[in-house]
């Protein structure tokens, strides 16, 4: 001789976010007469998910027709599952009572776990640009995933980084989780074309990790090197002086020529040439009329790059001496030119 049992055959059910969860429940008898209700959680704070007797539960459908005589299948389907639906669901048999139905027996519960994909990782770098040899921090964030287990890796140009710290929040049980990681990257002069990649692997991604990228071109500033040289005579009374601005990034650059400390001309880099490593070169010419000068002339090429303090390089032009090529000797790469006469 037995009384009714409520059987929930599945101890746990795992469902992907957006899908439908089936929670199975059968009773072993038609008696005692009374409705079945489904709850999430136990105790006084439990949440009603479905009531056979009354109420509107738009996301819930019954697996079988509960109006059929002798129906003892009280399984339900919950549609469009989100991580917020995770929890333990109890199928509870009530018996008819006056004035209210009385809870008679509960199933053992089915734990619904929701597999939710992490959001696309968002990588952000420092607010201000930094120069080579400096260490900068990149952060990577991804949200809304479940279960909690997740793997995050950092790469720079395909090479895995090791200097990073990662946190998954919250620490305790939650419907979904977030990951936050900070990686330290040492910049080099060759990093204009470099990429920092944050890679997130999760059970929901079926071996196809999500990646977030940051281009170091947004982070790096490569200061230029300057070389001022005097070119061969073009005419008896003219000397051509060039300022070669090499290996700079980004392109934003303003050049000022000074003759004996006085501004002669200011120009903005326009027709630059790009090097293989992504940096730029630019060349500015200054045509000096020697006959206009009685004394030696100090020519200064002053460059303000990307809003930074100006750097300069000078060249002494001897008026008395027969003009000849002189100046610093750093090798030039591809150069652009700019010609201007000064009278």
């Amino acid at each position: 001789e037995e009384e009714l049992q409520v059987i929930q055959p599945d101890k746990s059910v795992l469902v992907a976010a957006g899908e439908t969860a089936t929670l199975r429940c059968t009773a072993t008898s038609l008696i005692p007469v009374g409705p079945i209700q489904w709850f999430r959680g136990a105790g006084p704070g439990r949440e009603l998910i479905y009531n056979q007797k009354e109420g509107h539960f738009p996301r819930v459908t019954t697996v079988s027709d509960l109006t059929k005589r002798n129906n003892m299948d009280f399984s339900i389907r919950i549609g469009n599952i989100t991580p917020a639906d995770a929890g333990t669901y109890y199928c509870v048999k009530f018996r008819k009572g006056s004035p209210d139905d009385v809870e008679f027996k509960s199933g053992a519960g089915t734990e619904l776990s929701v597999r939710a994909k992490p959001s696309a990782p968002v990588v952000s770098g420092p607010a201000a640009r930094a120069t080579p040899q400096h260490t900068v921090s990149f952060t990577c964030e991804s949200h809304g995933f479940s279960p909690r287990d997740i793997t995050l890796k950092w790469f720079k140009n395909g090479n895995e980084l090791s200097d990073f710290q990662t946190n998954v929040d919250p620490v305790g049980e939650s419907v979904s989780y977030s990951i936050h990681s900070t990686a330290k990257v040492v910049l080099t002069r060759e990093d204009v074309h470099s990429q920092v990649i944050c890679e997130v692997a999760h059970v929901t991604l079926q071996g196809d990790p999500l990646r977030g990228t940051a281009n170091l071109s947004e982070t790096i500033r490569v200061p230029p090197t300057l070389e001022v040289t005097q070119q061969p005579v073009r005419a008896e009374n003219q000397v051509n002086v060039t300022c070669q601005v090499r290996k700079f990034y980004p392109q934003r650059l303003q050049l000022t020529w000074l003759e004996n400390g006085n501004v002669s001309r200011t120009e903005t880099a326009s027709t630059v040439t790009e090097n293989k490593d992504g940096t730029y070169n630019w060349m500015s010419w200054l045509l000096v009329n020697v006959s206009a000068h009685r004394d030696d002339v100090k020519l200064t090429c002053q460059v303000e790059h990307d809003g930074q303090p100006a750097v300069s390089k000078s060249h002494d032009l001897k008026v008395s001496a027969h003009p000849k090529e002189q100046g610093s000797n750093t090798a030039a790469e591809n150069t652009g030119s700019n010609e201007r006469n000064i009278y």
Partner: antibody
Framework: QVQLQQSGPELVKPGASVKMSCKAS????????LSWVKQRTGQGLEWIGE????????YYNEKFKGKATLTADKSSNTAYIQLTSLTSEDSAVYFC?????????????WGQGTLLTVSA | ENVLTQSPEKMAVSLGQKVTMTCSAS???????LHWYQQKSGASPKPLIH???NLASGVPARFSGSGSGTSYSLTISSVEAEDAATYYC?????????FGGGTNLEIK
């Protein structure tokens, strides 16, 4: 048509046990809940409990727990009530009854009753 | 349990008279869960009205029922000799199923 045929009258001594039967016909026995109702002479009706023969599960009025045991035999379409430790208070007519339907709640069909007399 | 109290316990009426008996519940009963039976001496109860006002099969139209909540009644519009019996109300709103103490109708 639905019929519930109950066993004949019983005369038993105090302290003894008795088992009375209710044979169902005219419907699928295992699909319907059967109840047992007690009526003492000149008194009202008291619901004892019910049995669902489909899974041989029972539900009792608290007042009759320990006194009555309901069973069923699907092969013979018969329900039984066993009463133990009998006293004169158990002397009554015992009816089996079936609801019109599972969710009807009214006894559409009744057996003719079995008179139980407990006497030394 | 939901106690059903019937009144009067006994009544004696003349043929053709209108009769009303009441059934009062200690807890509210859904109208679909209140039923009436007729029991003649030495016989089993016979279903009379189910769900407050629905006549069971073969029951004459002179019988009617009404009520809601905790108060229900059974009316016989014009009593006939065959109506002499005890009438019981029964609730199916909550366990245990209970019956009223009965109203015994005697024909004068």
């Amino acid at each position: 048509q639905v019929q519930l045929q109950q066993s004949g009258p019983e005369l038993v001594k105090p302290g003894a046990s008795v088992k009375m039967s209710c044979k169902a016909s005219g419907y699928t026995f295992s699909e319907y809940v059967l109840s047992w109702v007690k009526q003492r002479t000149g008194q009202g009706l008291e619901w004892i409990g019910e049995i669902y023969p489909g899974t041989i599960t029972t539900y009792y009025n608290e007042k009759f727990k320990g006194k009555a045991t309901l069973t069923a035999d699907k092969s013979s379409n018969t329900a039984y009530i066993q009463l133990t430790s009998l006293t004169s208070e158990d002397s009554a007519v015992y009816f089996c009854g079936r609801f019109y339907d599972y969710d009807g709640g009214w006894f559409a069909y009744w057996g003719q009753g079995t008179l139980l007399t407990v006497s030394a | 349990e939901n106690v059903l109290t019937q009144s009067p316990e006994k009544m004696a009426v003349s043929l053709g008279q209108k009769v009303t008996m009441t059934c009062s519940a200690s807890s509210s009963v859904s109208s679909s869960d209140l039923h009436w039976y007729q029991q003649k001496s030495g016989a089993s109860p016979k279903p009379l009205i189910h769900g407050t006002s629905n006549l069971a099969s073969g029951v004459p139209a002179r019988f009617s029922g009404s009520g809601s909540g905790t108060s229900y009644s059974l009316t016989i519009s014009s009593v006939e000799a065959e109506d002499a019996a005890t009438y019981y109300c029964q609730q199916w709103s909550g366990y245990p199923w209970t019956f009223g103490g009965g109203t015994n109708l005697e024909i004068k």
